[in-house]
């Protein structure tokens, strides 16, 4: 808090100039009108202000607008938004995306903080979903963003902003939001052709289910061993040994080097062992031959 | 994390000149307004130069006519270039801008003894 001095002659701001960074706290708190500040807003980031002299314009724009700052003050914040908490930012309404942009730019490069996630939030609950454009700017700042949302935030997310979606936003996504995510993907894609689509889906398959990979295998997509190592255990597990070849194409040598590894180990483990020796990869593990499975869980069902 | 790293300071006689010179990492200074600060013993920080974004100069009273603040935008780097130097020039020089200097982050800073 400032102490209330007057401020001395001749140095009442008439404009937000650089000639403020030589004011200490006091005269700056004494000769900037708040009312000048909010108008003149858009010099401030010109200006190498310190972290001291930011506390006293903040606190001048707080006297102003004690419910909260209007969009055409909080879209010239530039490093002041540094300065905001939280609770500041709750009071907000941000509606423009240039506005989100301008502000997102003061910390690009540093880790998402407090503000900034508060921002978003605010942001994104009060256009309803996360439409394409939101999307596009929110992953470009940061690529963990649609990784940090809840399965139920996602769910907010329409099939058409996933065209908006890159491989790297789904990096950190664990399979639960994968889970909601690829629906929405294959929604999104359903008009492309194989191979393109193929390319498109691949990074949100570690939400397909099995009736998904069995269609997959018979259009020779040849899939990666990252992507199969990424797919749903209980997805992998009732696929043959032959859709598995089908699928991964001149990739499945990589099954290998991955034996010991989910969801490789799980699958081998339900597979004949005749059925795996005709790979020729030496996988082991597998259901002797003259050995009969009961599908227990089957029969739970049933029961 | 952003770094700063200041350079230049010395020893120098009144009537001398040093031309200090500061590093940031990323492109800070390229983009943003910057300052050159001084702290002598005993006493605060206190702002000596500055360049706004637009690439206008504002000068400490002290300084004003020895003292020339510029950078390269290329080499993400500033200057300061101090003539005619005074004992009570004496302190060391801090620069900073953008994101850092809001966050109140500095670097080590760099010692200059008029003498």
């Known amino acids: 808090e400032v102490e209330k001095t007057a401020c001395p002659s001749g140095k009442k701001a008439r404009e937000i100039d650089e000639s403020l960074i030589f004011y200490k706290k006091w005269e700056l708190e004494a000769c900037v009108d708040a009312a000048l500040l909010a108008t003149q807003m858009d010099r401030v980031n010109a200006i190498p202000f310190t972290y001291e002299q930011l506390d006293v314009l903040k606190h001048k724009l707080d006297e102003l607008y004690p419910q909260g700052y209007p969009e055409s003050v909080i879209q010239h914040l530039g490093y002041l938004f540094l300065k905001m908490s939280p609770e500041d930012i709750r009071k907000w309404n941000v509606t423009s995306l240039e506005t989100l942009k301008a502000l997102l730019e003061v910390n690009k490069g540093h880790e998402m903080s407090p503000q900034v996630a508060t921002l978003i939030d605010r942001f994104v609950k009060g256009r309803g979903q996360l439409d394409k454009d939101t999307l596009d700017t929110l992953t470009a700042f940061y690529p963990g963003y649609l990784c940090s949302l809840s399965p139920e935030e996602l769910s907010s997310v329409p099939p058409s902003s996933i065209w908006a979606v890159r491989p790297q936003d789904l990096d950190t996504c664990d399979p639960r939001q994968l889970d909601v995510l690829y629906p929405k993907a294959r929604l999104a894609f359903q008009n492309m052709n194989g191979s393109e689509y193929f390319v498109k889906i691949q990074s949100f398959l570690g939400g397909a289910p099995t009736e998904d990979l069995k269609a997959l295998s018979q259009q020779n997509v040849s899939m990666d061993l990252a992507t199969f190592m990424k797919l749903r255990t209980d997805a992998v597990l009732p696929l043959t040994v032959a859709e598995v070849q089908k699928l991964l194409g001149p990739h499945v040598e990589g099954l290998k080097a991955e034996e010991r590894h989910r969801p490789v180990r799980d699958w081998i483990l339900r597979q004949r062992q005749d059925d795996l020796d005709t790979l020729g990869l030496g996988l082991q593990g597998g259901i002797p031959n003259g050995y009969l499975v009961l599908d227990l869980s089957m029969q739970e069902a049933l029961s | 994390q952003v770094q700063l790293v200041e350079s230049g300071g010395g020893l120098v006689q009144p009537g001398g000149s040093l031309r200090l010179s500061c590093a940031a990492s990323?492109?800070?200074?390229?983009?943003?307004?910057v300052a050159w600060y001084r702290q002598a013993p005993g006493e605060q920080r206190e702002p000596v130069a500055a360049?706004?974004?637009?690439?206008?100069?504002i000068y400490a009273d002290s300084v004003k006519g020895r003292f020339t603040i510029s950078r390269d935008n290329a080499k993400n780097t500033v200057y300061l270039q101090m003539s005619s130097l005074k004992p009570e020039d004496t302190a060391v020089y801090y620069c900073?801008?953008?994101?850092?200097?809001?966050?109140?982050?500095w670097g080590q800073g760099t010692s200059v003894t008029v003498s």
């Open positions: 360049m706004t974004s637009g690439g206008s100069t």
């Open positions: 900073n801008g953008g994101w850092s200097l809001a966050m109140d982050y």
């Open positions: 990323g492109s800070m200074f390229s983009i943003n307004a």
